[in-house]
């Protein structure tokens, strides 16, 4: 470091250092002044600072603080933002795969159902995607709608392929009969349980990541109080007013000042810790039926089993539905 | 544990699933994220210290500035004197957080509550008997959570299938598939899906 300077009879060095922040010299006294108007850098004797300089220092100090805070959180912010994007895209890919698997299953095993089945499957997985992204959709309704839509097609194409066109207006009745007769056994309920549990967890996982981003963004853009600005000015700049151009703040003093400035922000700490630990617990539980990847990619198999179940009981069902959905009784299922 | 067979037999027709070597599943990626997040668990309490360590403070110098005067770095005055004539620091702390911070704390409390609710110890959740009316149905065995469905000729268990750097590809475009096709056999190949997602550090 340079040797300590002799006392400055003029304010020459203070003037030059102030120009780092503010071009021009009109705010800096030519020679030391009493400084009775100063509010932050309270002088013990004559000073080379003016009220205008103090104001500039305070403004700069608060901007410095904001930049320091932003640089402190940059790595954490990037970590959460990138992961939120990665997982959102990954979940969309899982949904797309699940849809393709299910469509492939229909194409391979029930080609006669495919045109309509593809449509219903597509609608179901669109709803799944929307639900994950926070849409206000009921999972049970989604599953019910899938099976309600599928059953009339299964009945008319697989169970009763020779059904005359005149009988095709019984769709509403078939939808009603599907639930009343538990046509697919407990498979719809099974799917509801698995899909709702796995999607709920997935949805809250994404919500939590997005809130994490919001937390960092909020603290990143905090405006520091005037009191904090005064403390920072005194710590970083007031030494200049005494001609001390090379000294740095004491470490302990810096900690005290920062704790004062950050008192509000530090209150987040308790809830932030809990957030990370709760998220960890959630992630540890995301397996089996709480893992959407596992559940959705296995749906094609469960749906296939549910159709086999219907086929196995086709004789019994056809008789019952023939009676229930005769024209005279059609209305009660509307 | 669950497995995903190389060949899925469905009504004697085969859906071949691409064999994937990559072990980076969604679940491993989630765990990796949590480990990284845990290194930031003290982020907010550590902020004052972090900022002091990234702003100029006297480390090797004999003298330092305490807000009022030049003092010896290890003297009592180094932390104390500078605070004397400043406004009341206790007062500053008593003001409490500003409204935006209070709001974000409320949101954190809410999400923490939701996360805790979701993470409750999980009991058995599926009915063992899939059909209450007595029609035949496959038995899911002891581990109902793992049973994705089964009937007649044996159930299929599913392993976490989507791998991060590999996509299971079928050689049919299901959206344009002709309705009367009797069989479509997926290829044993892989298509990279996550190439554009990069690694998160």
């Amino acid at each position: 470091q340079p040797p300590p300077p002799p006392p400055d009879a003029t304010c020459h060095q203070v003037r030059s250092f102030f120009q780092r922040l503010q071009p021009g010299l009109k705010w800096v006294p030519e020679t030391p002044v009493p400084g009775s108007d100063l509010q932050v850098c309270l002088p013990k004797g004559p000073t080379c600072c003016s009220r205008k300089m103090e104001e500039k220092y305070q403004l700069t100090a608060r901007l410095n603080m904001e930049q320091l805070l932003q640089s402190a959180s940059m790595e954490l912010k990037f970590l959460i933002i990138q992961n939120a994007a990665v997982f959102q895209e990954a979940f969309e890919i899982v949904v797309r795969h699940a849809k393709n698997y299910t469509n492939a299953m229909f194409k391979n095993n029930y080609p006669s159902l495919t045109p309509q089945a593809f449509e219903f499957v597509g609608e179901f997985f669109t709803d799944v995607s929307l639900y994950i992204l926070g849409s206000d959709i009921n999972v049970d309704d989604m599953v019910n709608e899938l099976f309600d839509s599928l059953f009339p097609v299964i009945y008319t194409q697989l169970m009763n392929p020779g059904l005359p066109d005149s009988a095709l207006d019984i769709n509403e009745c078939l939808r009603g009969a599907r639930r009343d007769l538990k046509v697919f056994g407990n498979f719809p309920k099974l799917i509801m349980t698995q899909v709702s549990k796995s999607l709920q967890v997935t949805r809250i996982f994404l919500q939590a990541l997005n809130l994490g981003i919001e937390v960092i963004n909020t603290t990143d853009h905090l405006k520091f109080s005037k009191d904090c600005g005064r403390m920072l000015t005194r710590m970083w700049y007031c030494s200049y007013c005494q001609g001390l151009m090379m000294v740095k703040p004491c470490g302990g003093y810096c900690n005290v000042v920062m704790q004062g400035c950050m008192a509000g922000v530090v209150e987040i700490d308790k809830y932030w810790r809990e957030y990370i630990l709760s998220l960890e617990e959630l992630v540890n539980g995301m397996y089996r039926i709480y893992d959407m990847e596992n559940v959705l990619l296995g749906l094609f198999s469960t749906i296939h089993d549910s159709i086999q179940y219907v086929q196995k009981n086709a004789g019994k069902l056809t008789t019952t539905i023939g009676k229930l959905c005769a024209h005279s009784q059609q209305r009660q299922y509307r | 544990s669950a497995y995903y067979p190389e060949d899925l037999f469905i009504d004697k027709k085969v859906l071949k699933v691409a064999h994937v070597e990559h072990e980076e599943t969604l679940s491993s990626r989630r765990r990796e994220l949590i480990q990284k997040l845990k290194s930031f668990i003290s982020f907010y309490s550590a902020l004052p210290g972090y900022i002091c360590s990234h702003s100029p403070v006297a480390e090797n110098d004999t003298l330092c500035w305490n807000g009022q005067e030049l003092v010896e770095r290890y003297s009592q005055k180094a932390a104390r004197n500078g605070m004397k004539n400043q406004f009341n620091l206790h007062e500053l702390k008593m003001k409490g957080p500003e409204p935006v911070v209070s709001q974000i704390i409320d949101k954190l409390k809410h999400i923490n509550q939701l996360l805790r609710t979701m993470s409750m110890p999980k009991g058995r959740v599926l009915d063992k008997n899939l059909d209450e009316e007595g029609f035949e149905s496959g038995d899911c065995g002891d581990d109902e959570d793992e049973c994705i469905g089964g009937s007649g000729d044996g159930m299929i268990k599913v392993k976490n299938q989507l791998r991060f750097l590999a996509e299971l590809a079928y050689d049919l475009d299901v959206d344009d598939a002709p309705g009367n096709s009797q069989q479509a056999t997926p290829k044993d190949n892989e298509i990279s899906t996550f190439h554009n997602l990069g690694n998160v550090h």
Epitope: F17, F18, R20, L21, Y57, T60, A61, L63, N64, Q67, L68, S71, W236, Y237, S239, M246, V247, K248, P249 | H54, S55, P56
Partner: nanobody, 120 residues
């Protein structure tokens, strides 16, 4: 270990030119703003010039504007001060200093200085 080593000082006649260099190590040079500060014999410190990390932004004290040019080569981790039309009052020890993240605040690190003497 942060190190700043100045070189290029010497004796020069009024109106002459000199180019000072400062070799930096021990930190990420390209992301640090840098300054030149001088101390004339028997006088206090005077800030001379500053340059941003990328080199895109520069700043000078009024007394050297138009005569001195600050620059940097981030690939060589080196800071420069091109001094033209030198005057007797430019005689001083020139220090290069690493700016901290506190704009206009205390410098993080200083070099040991290089002496420039302007005399006929």
């Amino acid at each position: 270990q942060v190190q700043l080593v100045e070189s290029g000082g010497g004796l020069v006649q009024p109106g002459g030119s000199l180019r000072l260099s400062c070799a930096a190590s021990g930190f990420t040079f390209s992301s640090s703003a840098m300054s030149w500060v001088r101390q004339a014999p028997g006088k206090g410190l005077e800030w001379v010039s500053a340059i941003s990390g990328s080199g895109g932004s520069t700043n000078y004290v009024d007394s050297v504007k138009g005569r001195f040019t600050v620059s940097r080569d981030n690939s060589k981790n080196t800071l420069y001060l091109q001094m033209n039309r030198l005057r007797a009052e430019d005689t001083a020890v020139y220090y290069c200093a690493k700016e901290s993240m506190v704009r206009g605040g205390p410098f993080d690190y200083w070099g040991q200085g290089t002496t420039v003497t302007v005399s006929s």
